[in-house]
């Protein structure tokens, strides 16, 4: 009965087997059943899935564009990944929204002890943050370099100015 | 100019380019350029995009091939960021939009993202940035100090 919304017919693009395959693969990447995966392992995870949910490597940019929510520690919730991959297959539709809601309700109800999580960023925002961090880091390293060059120049001049005193 | 890019950067650009080259003909439309660049973490304005297109789309046919795209990205990466661009970069981490970033948040960002600073570098950065030692960094002033000639 799992996920029988949008999986009634065998001709449907997504079936119960696909969701089972997702969770079986998930278990290998999250053996402690935390429900989260490190962003750094996401590329390997989606490449390990079978069609139609698989996103083959190179897939880093694709995963950025999926705009997945991330929680502190750069971790992503399994449901958010499953929703995004399902959306890739089914497209954006009312049917997709209904499936997402059903899956979410079933998942939360089946795991009533799990703490609800608060995403702080997304994969797309994180990429932008990376680029912005690099701008600041490069500017600061340039500043350090210029400052050390000025100091060296000052020391050089100072030592030469005083050299005629002997 | 593309030889100034690392293998990793070229691979990333290739992936982004291919993702939006829907029909696989080796070109993207100038309309898609913004989307491609955003997927690479850039946030160009419409005016900036137009300037880039004018530079590389010499024949004006509204498409860009990968070598042209690579040249454009290499140019963008080579350019030294202006004071305003660095201020904009800081603004991304200013969640409250009040012109301040906590020293702790700045340390976290600088040592966990991008071209990570060493502990020594970040200690020095915070010493310079948090002048009064109240744990808050006024990044407007810090950027001015950093970019002063």
């Amino acid at each position: 009965e799992n996920f029988n919304v949008a999986t009634e017919e065998s001709s449907e693009p997504l079936g119960e087997d696909d969701f089972e395959m997702f969770y079986e693969t998930w278990e290998k990447f999250d053996p402690d059943a935390t429900q989260f995966i490190a962003y750094s392992r996401l590329s390997d995870f989606v490449d390990t899935l079978q069609e139609p949910l698989r996103i083959a490597k190179p897939n880093k940019i694709k995963l950025i564009t999926l705009d997945l929510p991330m929680v502190p520690g750069d971790k992503i919730h399994c449901l958010d990944i499953l929703f995004a991959l399902t959306k890739e297959v089914l497209g954006d539709s009312g049917e997709m929204d209904a499936l997402k809601q059903t899956m979410e309700e079933k998942f939360m109800a089946a795991n009533p002890s799990k703490v609800s999580y608060e995403p702080i960023t997304t994969t797309l925002k994180r990429k932008h943050e990376e680029v912005c961090a690099i701008k600041i880091q490069r500017a600061y390293r340039r500043h350090l370099l210029q400052r050390s060059m000025k100091q060296a120049s000052y020391m050089y001049r100072h030592s030469h100015d005083g050299s005629g005193d002997d | 100019m593309a030889d100034q890019l690392t293998e990793e950067q070229i691979a990333e650009f290739k992936e982004a380019f291919s993702l939006f080259d829907k029909d696989g003909d080796g070109t993207i439309t100038t309309k898609e350029l913004g989307t491609v660049m955003r997927s690479l973490g850039q946030n160009p304005t419409e005016a900036e995009l137009q300037d880039m297109i004018n530079e590389v789309d010499a024949d004006g046919n509204g498409t860009i091939d990968f070598p042209e795209f690579l040249t454009m990205m290499a140019r963008k990466m080579k350019d030294t960021d202006s004071e305003e661009e660095i201020r904009e970069a800081f603004r991304v981490f200013d969640k409250d939009g009040n012109g301040y970033i906590s020293a702790a948040e700045l340390r976290h960002v600088m040592t966990n993202l991008g071209e990570k600073l060493t502990d020594e570098e970040v200690d020095e950065m915070i010493r310079e940035a948090d002048i009064d030692g109240d744990g808050q960094v006024n990044y407007e002033e810090f950027v001015q100090m950093m970019t002063a000639k």
Partner: nanobody
Framework: QVQLQESGGGLVQPGGSLRLSCAAS????????LAWSRQAPGKQREFVAS????????YYSGSVKGRFTVSRDNAKETVYLQMNDLKPEDSAVYYC?????????????????WGRGTQVTVSS
């Protein structure tokens, strides 16, 4: 081994109430998520309610929300389902299920431990 034993079912008139109990043995009860599920003749088993080990509020299916209340007594190793304002469509066999709270599953169907069920019939 793990055993779940439901009780408290029976025949009740529409608008009436029943309280189901599920006694557990063979597991560290306080560490287990518990759920109630039901199955009417010729229909698929459906989720009713679940309760965890943390302070999170319980979950209820839309069809029973506001009428049913799930609770647990760790000392007695028992989970309860208080059913008020019963309707004919609530008639079904009610099952109790359990899983280790530290384990994540996709749906209630994946719970490893199930009771044999207790029949609830709502009829005038």
């Amino acid at each position: 081994q793990v055993q779940l034993q439901e009780s408290g079912g029976g025949l009740v008139q529409p608008g009436g109430s029943l309280r189901l109990s599920c006694a557990a043995s063979g597991l560290t009860f306080a560490n287990y998520d518990l759920a109630w599920s039901r199955q009417a003749p010729g229909k698929q088993r459906e989720f009713v309610a679940s309760i965890g080990v943390t302070r999170n509020p319980p979950y209820y299916s839309g069809s029973v929300k506001g009428r049913f209340t799930v609770s647990r007594d760790n000392a007695k190793e028992t989970v309860y389902l208080q059913m008020n304002d019963l309707k004919p469509e609530d008639s079904a066999v009610y099952y109790c299920a359990a899983k280790d709270a530290s384990v994540t599953v996709a749906t209630i169907e994946d719970y490893p431990y199930w009771g044999r069920g207790t029949q609830v019939t709502v009829s005038s």
